[in-house]
């Protein structure tokens, strides 16, 4: 399954667009930082067949699309942009949901693959837990948006590292 | 390869006006703050501001707010540390270096060698 | 503003030697403390990140620990490239703050 070309610009736009969604200075958040521990080697396409990598990519995007769709985070950002931002992410996991489809067939999926999925998901328990212990405070919401862009950053790259393997 | 190149030594007269650069290169110029220190002769290392180049947001020491302005170019991933009016006692070693933001990184992992500001009459 | 002072201001030790480095902040700083070495004439190089991370490429040999207001740099085995200027810095909080540096001269 080839990636459509629209799928990298959306992913750009995508971090674009949360970029602009700061509300407050970052500056007066320092003090907030966090390990969140992101799961780094799952960003890391060498070791994966294809489908794993697809599979991880696709529970990035949509652990993220769920962060980003609560109440919480409604209250959070500025509305166009949150629905923007909410639409490219909607577009990419459609992207990826017909390539997982395409792929799984091709290769059985091993249960390394479980772990890995397991490890995006328990990443971003973390940063949940993280913004239920911060009370949703403007800085923690600031923290999070920091770190979704890194980890965005990491599936763009991922992503980059696929096509160069077709 | 990660690298910040700054712009050569000056030698400038009290009253004048100054702006050197720090170029980054081989990482996401915006991702990442870029930090300036001063280091005076023989003394130790003074922050003095930072500024995030995806927004030119910028924060400043007290020691040197008003005395100095931090800008950015993301277009051409350039961050400038300006004086409008030198003083003899900025006569020091300045130094840029990469911030990870509110990112649980290492802070301060890649520095610009440094340009050497002698003010004197 | 959070001050960080660090001591000794100057020591000397020989090639072998354990080497200890204290810093302590004004305020507590959790564990947001930094430790660099610069030598002569160089930019500052960053050792070791948020009190005991050892920066990629850093020799073993450097560790640090501490949390809250105290923190230490230890160097387990003096080398002859390891004689410099060491500062901490926090990073806890704006405007960051960098203690006044420790030399480690030849004994």
């Known amino acids: 399954c080839d990636l459509p070309q629209t799928h990298s610009l959306g992913n750009r736009r995508a971090l674009i667009l949360l970029g602009q969604m700061g509300r407050i200075s970052p500056f007066s958040c320092l003090k907030d930082r966090h390990d969140f521990r992101i799961p780094q080697e799952e960003f890391d396409g060498n070791q994966f067949q294809k489908a794993q990598a697809i599979s991880v990519l696709h529970e990035m995007i949509q652990q993220t699309f769920n962060l980003f769709s609560t109440e919480d985070s409604s209250a959070a950002w500025e509305q166009s942009l949150l629905e923007k931002f909410s639409t490219e992410l909607y577009q990419q996991l459609n992207d990826l949901e017909a390539c997982v489809i395409q792929e799984v067939g091709v290769e059985e999926t091993p249960l390394m693959n479980e772990d890995s999925i397991l490890a995006v998901r328990k990443y971003f328990q973390r940063i949940t837990l993280y913004l239920i212990e911060r009370k949703y405070s403007p800085c923690a919401w600031e923290v999070v948006r920091a770190e979704i862009m890194r980890s965005l950053s990491f599936s763009t790259n991922l992503q980059k590292r696929l096509r160069r393997k077709d | 390869e990660v690298q910040l190149v700054q712009s050569g030594a000056e030698v400038k007269k009290p009253g004048e006006s100054l702006k050197i650069s720090c170029k980054g290169s081989g990482y996401s110029f915006t991702s990442y703050w870029i930090g300036w220190v001063r280091q005076m002769p023989g003394k130790g290392l003074e922050w003095m501001g930072i500024?995030?180049?995806?927004?030119?947001?910028?924060a400043y020491s007290p020691s040197f707010q008003g005395q100095v302005t931090i800008s950015a170019d993301k277009s051409i991933s350039t961050a400038y540390l300006q004086w409008s009016s030198l003083k003899a006692s900025d006569t020091a070693m300045y130094y840029c270096a990469r911030h990870p933001g509110l990112n649980w990184a290492p802070d301060f992992d890649y520095w610009g060698q440094g340009t050497l500001v002698t003010v004197s009459s | 503003d959070i001050q960080m002072t660090q001591s000794p201001s100057s020591l000397s030790a020989s090639v072998g030697d354990r080497v200890t480095i204290t810093c302590r902040a004004s305020q507590s700083i959790d564990g947001a403390l930094n430790w660099y070495q610069q030598k002569p004439g160089k930019a500052p190089k960053l050792l070791i990140y948020f009190a005991s991370s050892l920066q990629s490429g850093v020799p073993s040999r450097f560790s640090g620990s501490g949390s809250g207001t105290d923190f230490t740099l230890t160097i387990s085995s003096l080398q002859p490239e390891d004689f410099a200027t060491y500062y901490c810095?926090?990073?806890?909080?704006?405007?960051?703050?960098f203690g006044q540096g420790t030399k480690v001269e030849i004994k």
């Open positions: 810095q926090q990073s806890f909080d704006f405007p960051l703050t």
């Open positions: 500024i995030d180049p995806s927004d030119s947001d910028t």
